[in-house]
Structure formats: structure tokens, C-alpha cells
């Protein structure tokens, strides 16, 4: 659910961390309508996720830890 690189809504699916290679943050005050986490998957898809949802926070935390440990 994205338009001109802006997420317009959120996925209703839950993704596994093994499916995700990275993420970018979309901020509502930087030209887009909503805050979002954009997950980049191993299948080269971009998935818009709700940053308030627990599973999204969990994956963001996991990926952030990985980057810190590199």
C-alpha cells in the first residue's frame, strides 16, 4: 500500500524476521500521510507495517540489534 514511496496503509499480515533484510522508517511529518515501517523482504518486496504493533516493534528491535553488533 504505497504511492510515490509513501505507505498509504498497513499490511494485515504478520511477517517472520527471517523474511526481512532491513527496514526504513516513514514519518508523517516528512511528506507522507502516516507513520510506517517499510520492511524490505528477501523477495525484494516492500511491506508497509504499523509501527505501533508489537510484532513490528519486535522485528525493528531485532534488526537494530543486528546492525549494532556488526
Amino acid at each position: 500500500a504505497s504511492n510515490f514511496d509513501c505507505c498509504l496503509g498497513y499490511t494485515d499480515r504478520i511477517l517472520h524476521p527471517k523474511f526481512i533484510v532491513g527496514f526504513t522508517r516513514q514519518l508523517a511529518n516528512e511528506g507522507c500521510d502516516i507513520n510506517a515501517i517499510i520492511f524490505h523482504t528477501k523477495k525484494k518486496l516492500s511491506v508497509c507495517a504499523n509501527p505501533k504493533q508489537t510484532w513490528v516493534k519486535y522485528i525493528v528491535r531485532l534488526l537494530s540489534k543486528k546492525v549494532k553488533n556488526m
Epitope: R13, I14, L15, H16, K18, F19, K42, K52, Q53, T54, W55, Y58
Partner: antibody, heavy 120, light 107 residues
Framework: QVQLVQSGAEVKKPGASVKVSCKAS????????MHWVRQAPGQGLEWMGV????????TYNQKFKGKATLTVDTSTSTAYMELSSLRSEDTAVYYC?????????????WGQGTLVTVSS | DIQMTQSPSSLSASVGDRVTITCRAS??????LNWYQQKPGKAPKLLIY???NLADGVPSRFSGSGSGRQYSLTISSLQPEDFATYYC?????????FGGGTKLEIK
């Protein structure tokens, strides 16, 4: 120890609704998902949907959208699964099961199951 | 949705045998796969998570392997209590899907 205790067997008429409960104990209820899985007589396992008790976020198997409704009561650490417009093919054992992302999103503890029989 | 195909659907074996059950996904699931054991009239029990990790309390005769689309569960030396039905499960993305099950029976 972790326990999921489900409500007892139900017999319902076609068109009716049923609400199955799942009382959790032995862990922090809001820290783990609660999944619901269906098993028709003599058949395999079918994932219905999941609820995050911390914020009541739900996602469903498309097949069960409009058929099943998942809710939680965090004050009593209880999850509920309501089935509406029952038909004979909804006759099955329904399981609640804890989803643990610490063990690779696995379902690590299961309720004992609730048999729902739909019969006229 | 990701389809999970288990084989064989049933298997006869003897105590002490080594048995392997396989599970094939319709697409790459990157190791996001779990295995469960179910005995008649009982709830399933988690055996293996993340394709290769043994769940708490599960005997070491059980092992999981595989990657990509192809996974397997091996029991190195069958015990009488191992005769049950085994299911694989994809957890890469919802809807989570189970294999059709493998019923392991005494020969």
C-alpha cells in the same frame, strides 16, 4: 507452569453462535500472542487467526474472516473465539495456543481443545 | 498462501527404526518452519522450531533439518511413545499453514 484451560464442549444448532474461552496462567498474558487452530474430525490442523493481547490486534485466515471473532480480556487473562452462523462443517475441535516469537514464532503451549458440534 | 506438502501421509515402522518425514513448501520459507506431534485425543505438542531447534523437554532422538523449500523431521530410534501424527507448519507469513500430517504407526 504455563497452562491454557479451555471451556467445555458445546452442541449448537445450525445458524447459532458459540463463544469458546481460553484462560491463561503461569505467564504474562500480554507478552505472547494467542492463536486459534481448528481440527475437524479425522482431519489435520488449520490456522484460524491470532490476537495480540497487548493491543487486541488481530489477523485472520481469509477463510475465517466474518466467521470467527477473536477477543481478549486482559483483566482475567482470558482469550475468546466466537464463531457465528454455525454450519455442520464447523463441527471440530478448536484449540487456543500461545504464540512465542522467542521460539521462532512457534506455538509452544496448547489448550486441551474444545469440541464444538453443530447439529440440528 | 504458502502450501505445505508432507510425505508420506502414513508410515509403518518398528521400535528402534530410524524414520524421516519430509515437508515441502510451495515457495522458499527461509527456515521459518516448526514441527508438532499429536497423539489421538490430545492437543499438538511443539517438537522443533526454526527448522532445526529442539523444543524444551523434547528427546534428542528427534532432529530437524532443511532449508529453502524442503525440510525433514528425523527420529533416530523410534520409541513406543513416538507413534503419533506429525505436522509441519509454515510461519514465514500469515496465514500460517500446516502440512497434511504424517501418521506414524507400529508395524
Amino acid at each position: 507452569q504455563v497452562q491454557l484451560v479451555q471451556s467445555g464442549a458445546e452442541v449448537k444448532k445450525p445458524g447459532a453462535s458459540v463463544k469458546v474461552s481460553c484462560k491463561a496462567s503461569g505467564y504474562t498474558f500480554t507478552n505472547y500472542w494467542m492463536h486459534w487452530v481448528r481440527q475437524a474430525p479425522g482431519q489435520g490442523l488449520e490456522w484460524m487467526g491470532v490476537i495480540d493481547p497487548s493491543d487486541s490486534y488481530t489477523t485472520y485466515n481469509q477463510k475465517f474472516k466474518g466467521k470467527a471473532t477473536l477477543t481478549v480480556d486482559t483483566s482475567t487473562s482470558t482469550a475468546y473465539m466466537e464463531l457465528s452462523s454455525l454450519r455442520s462443517e464447523d463441527t471440530a475441535v478448536y484449540y487456543c495456543t500461545r504464540g512465542n516469537y522467542g521460539v521462532d514464532y512457534a506455538m509452544d503451549y496448547w489448550g486441551q481443545g474444545t469440541l464444538v458440534t453443530v447439529s440440528s | 498462501d504458502i502450501q505445505m506438502t508432507q510425505s508420506p501421509s502414513s508410515l509403518s515402522a518398528s521400535v528402534g527404526d530410524r524414520v524421516t518425514i519430509t515437508c515441502r513448501a510451495s515457495e522458499n520459507i527461509y527456515g521459518a518452519l516448526n514441527w508438532y506431534q499429536q497423539k489421538p485425543g490430545k492437543a499438538p505438542k511443539l517438537l522443533i522450531y526454526g527448522a532445526t531447534n529442539l523444543a524444551d523437554g523434547v528427546p534428542s532422538r528427534f532432529s530437524g533439518s532443511g532449508s529453502g523449500r524442503q525440510y525433514s523431521l528425523t527420529i533416530s530410534s523410534l520409541q513406543p511413545e513416538d507413534f503419533a501424527t506429525y505436522y509441519c507448519q509454515n510461519v514465514l507469513i500469515t496465514p500460517y499453514t500446516f502440512g497434511g500430517g504424517t501418521k506414524l504407526e507400529i508395524k
